[in-house]
């Protein structure tokens, strides 16, 4: 996930937000799966 050539603060911010959203989605899926399997 190189996410482009820009290293300014806005590009870094958008990349950080994307990572947080992605992790939240992944963890959310895992939690739902765990609940379903119980």
């Amino acid at each position: 996930h190189s996410d482009g050539i820009f290293t300014d603060s806005y590009s870094r911010y958008r990349k950080q937000m994307a990572v947080k959203k992605y992790l939240a989605a992944v963890l959310g899926k895992r939690y739902k799966q765990r609940v379903k399997n119980k």
């Epitope: 482009g4 050539i5 300014d8 590009s11 958008r14 990349k15």
Partner: antibody
Framework: VEESGGRLVTPGTPLTLTCTAS????????MGWVRQAPGKGLEWIGD?????TTDYASWVNGRFTISRTSTTVTLKMTSLTTEDTATYFC????????WGPGTLVTVSS | AAVLTQTPSPVSAAVGGTVTIKCQSS????????LAWYQQKPGQPPKLLIY???TLASGVPSRFKGSGSGTQFTLTINGVQCDDAATYYC???????????FGGGTEVVVK
């Protein structure tokens, strides 16, 4: 970078636009979509990160969906009205540093 | 959504002169500098000129200069050339990307 899929559709018809690239690997870049109505200014639609997470302009209201594969980025549009008639551009990076020539979508009854 | 207000069109300039285009945002952009400028000629897609308020994009001539912070930004073209005749747009990036928006555009006419 090149867009495709634009055509004449009637109001309410869904339409999917595709963005591809030759010579560059799109998978390593965030990609954005922008539109421009005939004779009007630019309008930011939204973008998709390398992780597949998306952000949209507040006016989109869930009508448009951006997604991606390893080689393409797509813009799915629903509930189209005549107001959506425009040239649709995809562009690379959050700063929209490299643009395609655009694809024209005409919504008319 | 944010509203970006640009200098009204058209702006006229003589070859070799200076053009100043202003862009005012209804709210502060992210980190006070998340603003870009684009040049668009008829029948062509826009081209990135400046990002992060003042950083020149790759391959853009140094006669283009971006400045400003917060809500007020300026694009200056020094030593205007015939090739600079185009419409110029600003784009603001915000804490909430849902607010991201372009300005209405400013047409530059070179005499």
């Amino acid at each position: 970078v090149e867009e495709s899929g634009g055509r004449l559709v009637t109001p309410g018809t869904p339409l999917t636009l595709t963005c591809t690239a030759s010579g560059i690997d799109l998978s390593g870049y965030a990609m954005g979509w922008v539109r421009q109505a005939p004779g009007k200014g630019l309008e930011w639609i939204g973008d998709i990160s390398t992780y597949g997470t998306t952000d949209y302009a507040s006016w989109v209201n869930g009508r448009f969906t951006i997604s991606r594969t390893s080689t393409t980025v797509t813009l799915k549009m629903t509930s189209l009205t005549t107001e959506d008639t425009a040239t649709y551009f995809c562009a690379r990076d959050y700063w929209l540093s490299l643009w395609g020539p655009g694809t024209l979508v005409t919504v008319s009854s | 959504a944010a509203v970006l207000t640009q200098t009204p069109s058209p702006v006229s300039a003589a070859v070799g002169g200076t053009v100043t285009i202003k862009c005012q945002s209804s709210q502060s952009v992210y980190d006070n500098n998340a603003l870009a400028w684009y040049q668009q000629k008829p029948g062509q897609p826009p081209k990135l000129l400046i990002y992060a308020a003042s950083t020149l994009a790759s391959g853009v001539p140094s006669r283009f200069k971006g400045s400003g912070s917060g809500t007020q930004f300026t694009l200056t073209i020094n030593g205007v050339q015939c090739d600079d005749a185009a419409t110029y747009y600003c784009l603001g990036g915000y804490d909430d990307p849902a607010d991201n928006a372009f300005g209405g555009g400013t047409e530059v006419v070179v005499k």
